[in-house]
């Protein structure tokens, strides 16, 4: 690539999404944000759910949507695989429902490739331990 060509990938500046196995991204992300600061605004809405610990994959999954992986070799951003989305949803949607909230449409698992292959690259993410949900105090109104 010539020096005059715009760099395809940018460093991830969102602290929560650093040190997750990849360190560069390219906006717009998979939901349409042009700026990492705006992606971060959306990510903040999920912090209590991350702290709750419903899925060990949640943080990686959210980062892969809001700051998808970028590589100089491929023009398109690499987001999560549908399998990881479904795994996270299966474990975290009941927690959101417990709070009275619906799973967000922006994280609809059908939007993501079912699995990683040459036609549709995606990230499988770290393995999710198939153990019962931790008995943590839900971070919800009225509880510390």
């Amino acid at each position: 690539f010539g020096d005059e060509e715009e760099r395809r990938c940018d460093p991830i500046r969102i602290s929560m999404c650093q040190n997750l196995g990849y360190n560069v991204t390219k906006m717009p992300n998979l939901v349409g944000h042009e700026l990492q600061t705006d992606a971060e605004l959306q990510l903040t809405t999920f912090t209590p759910l991350i702290q709750y610990g419903c899925s060990s994959q949640l943080q990686f999954f959210l980062c892969s949507v809001y700051v998808p992986m970028c590589t100089e070799k491929i023009n398109i951003p690499i987001g999560p695989c549908g399998g990881m989305c479904l795994s996270v949803k299966r474990r975290c949607e009941p927690v959101l429902k417990e709070f009275g909230f619906a799973w967000p449409e922006s994280l609809n698992c059908s939007k993501f490739p079912p699995q990683n292959d040459h036609n549709h690259m995606c990230m499988e993410g770290p393995g999710d331990e198939e153990v019962p949900l931790p008995h943590k105090t839900p971070i919800q109104p009225g509880e510390e």
């Epitope: 605004l41 903040t44 209590p48 702290q51 922006s106 510390e144």
Partner: antibody, heavy 117, light 107 residues
Framework: EVQLVESGGGLVQPGGSLRLSCAAS????????MHWVRQAPGKGLEWVAS????????SYADSVKGRFTISADTSKNTAYLQMNSLRAEDTAVYYC??????????WGQGTLVTVSS | DIQMTQSPSSLSASVGDRVTITCRAS??????VAWYQQKPGKAPKLLIY???SLYSGVPSRFSGSRSGTDFTLTISSLQPEDFATYYC?????????FGQGTKVEIK
């Protein structure tokens, strides 16, 4: 029960400073972003600033950038808004609000800041 | 900045009326829109989140919808306690912005 209690408002001269506090109870502010929103007399709502301790990040409205500083003391479960170089147009009721998945779901009662000579 | 243009700025209605308030975003905000109710001297209260989801404890006569960048708050049958000012808000991108507000008054 979730509660947000603002304090620190009052009458201040143009160019002066004030520090507003937002004491939270019933939840841990480390896990939420905390926002300040103001409302001038008889006017609508204006977002001022936000802080997310989890992300170590802050953001400001252009109208207050460089003059206001938002911070949080997680050990005291309190958010702050340091307001310097105050102007007449900063006169408003200042609310703090908790922000997460559904939006700003809990708000304080507000504290009035009046900038006048 | 994303502008949220809210209309009407005020309206007069009677108990039992169906009331519709609209908000248009100046650019795409996905479904990152909330609606709030505010009564004089009080803090705003969350009614609708994610454009169309009813917040916990809010009466079912309130509903929200989205069509592209147009967002609507509907009160199906206005009750005496619903006379207040309503605001839309986008939290898709910084700075977070509110609509100008709609004051719902008694006819």
């Amino acid at each position: 029960e979730v509660q947000l209690v603002e304090s620190g408002g009052g009458l201040v001269q143009p160019g002066g400073s004030l520090r507003l506090s937002c004491a939270a109870s019933g939840f841990n502010i480390s896990y939420y972003s905390m926002h300040w929103v103001r409302q001038a007399p008889g006017k609508g709502l204006e977002w001022v600033a936000s802080i997310s301790s989890y992300y170590s990040s802050t953001s400001y409205a252009d109208s207050v950038k460089g003059r206001f500083t938002i911070s949080a003391d997680t050990s005291k479960n309190t958010a702050y808004l340091q307001m310097n170089s105050l102007r007449a147009e900063d006169t408003a009721v200042y609310y703090c609000a908790r922000f997460w998945y559904p939006g700003m779901d809990y708000w304080g009662q507000g504290t009035l800041v009046t900038v006048s000579s | 900045d994303i502008q949220m243009t809210q209309s009407p700025s005020s309206l007069s209605a009677s108990v039992g009326d169906r009331v519709t308030i609209t908000c248009r975003a100046s650019q795409s905000v996905s479904s990152a829109v909330a609606w709030y109710q505010q009564k004089p001297g009080k803090a705003p209260k969350l009614l609708i989140y994610s454009a169309s989801s009813l917040y916990s404890g809010v009466p079912s006569r309130f509903s929200g919808s989205r069509s592209g960048t147009d967002f609507t708050l509907t009160i199906s049958s206005l009750q005496p306690e619903d006379f207040a000012t309503y605001y839309c808000q986008q939290h898709w991108s910084y700075p977070i912005t509110f609509g100008q507000g709609t004051k719902v008054e008694i006819k």
